[in-house]
Amino acid sequence: VPRWRQQWSGPGTTKRFPETVLARCVKYTEIHPEMRHVDCQSVWDAFKGAFISKHPCNITEEDYQPLMKLGTQTVPCNKILLWSRIKDLAHQFTQVQRDMFTLEDTLLGYLADDLTWCGEFNTSKINYQSCPDWRKDCSNNPVSVFWKTVSRRFAEAACDVVHVMLNGSRSKIFDKNSTFGSVEVHNLQPEKVQTLEAWVIHGGREDSRDLCQDPTIKELESIISKRNIQFSCKNIYRPDKFLQCVKNPEDSSCTSEI
């Protein structure tokens, strides 16, 4: 008789999840010499230990603490780039501007990027059929708690000028319910962070509006100012040109507004 299995509303664990995490860890430690001491088997064991045999709606930050310890890493606190709803461009940027870091440029962020995972209470099985959806099922699920934990710690580590890339094509350019709006904004440390600088990325070729005047950006400014952190905002009208100018800042066309 097949054992009854909880059906959740979200997609199941990414196929070949253990192999993917282990392979990513190995690749990361090969690319980043300062992390070559990391024991990827121990990293996988700690990752697995955070959710295996636990009810996937009852995961805590504490469950991920062993993994956090193994992911200890130097991140220049004044070179942090946050993003919301525009991950690909943020990653393209840090691939060019190698001294800046998104969360996914760290070992822990790299391991989990775009993956889904969950287990089942009292069994050592990984659930490949379905996992809890944040809205429809529960917020304390393995994936959501992981990203809340590492996002909070990443924001806490930031100092001086922190940059955030925002998607100007969205109806809510700043969304209070995003990870940036609900976690990172509130965990920037006012004693360490002087300024949050928002880069609003335009989508349309002919879009010349000043999206820094958008009501949601004004809302972000208000939240940040109340936390005694200065706020500044820049329009990036041409993201393609922006990236090109990061690659080749001496280009004569890069002196004009981008």
Epitope: G71, T72, Q73, T74, V75, C77, R153, A157, E191, K192
Partner: nanobody, 117 residues
Framework: EVQVLESGGGLVQPGGSLRLSCEAS????????MSWVRQAPGKGLEWVST????????DYADSVKGRFTISRDNSKKTLYLQMNSLRVEDTAVYYC??????????RGQGTLVTVSS
């Protein structure tokens, strides 16, 4: 601006003890969790221990549990690490850093601990 100054390192024989200190400035010390991390020669950064802002909660790497004790004196804005039963593998530069990790940007020069017979 967060600034820290570590001291107390030195050469010690296996089984010996040292007490590291870290004087902090530029921020409200008691508001922040503080950590010790270390870097052995030719190795990466390893987290050692963390203490909460009030000093009420502490956490240790398995490799130092039972041998090292982290503490703080908020009135002196100073963090400490008492290291007992030192081993050769504890040889490293020790840094103190604000926060609980896993992401650290240590601001001090660190203090070198060498355990050798």
């Amino acid at each position: 601006e967060v600034q820290v100054l570590e001291s107390g390192g030195g050469l010690v024989q296996p089984g010996g003890s040292l007490r590291l200190s870290c004087e902090a400035s530029g921020f409200t010390f008691s508001n922040f969790a503080m950590s010790w991390v270390r870097q052995a020669p030719g190795k990466g950064l390893e987290w050692v221990s963390t203490i909460s802002g009030s000093g009420g909660t502490t956490d240790y790497a398995d490799s130092v549990k039972g041998r090292f004790t982290i503490s703080r004196d908020n009135s002196k804005k100073t963090l400490y690490l008492q290291m007992n039963s030192l081993r050769v593998e504890d040889t490293a530069v020790y840094y103190c850093a604000d926060g609980r990790g896993p992401f650290f940007d240590y601001r001090g020069q660190g203090t070198l601990v060498t355990v050798s017979s």
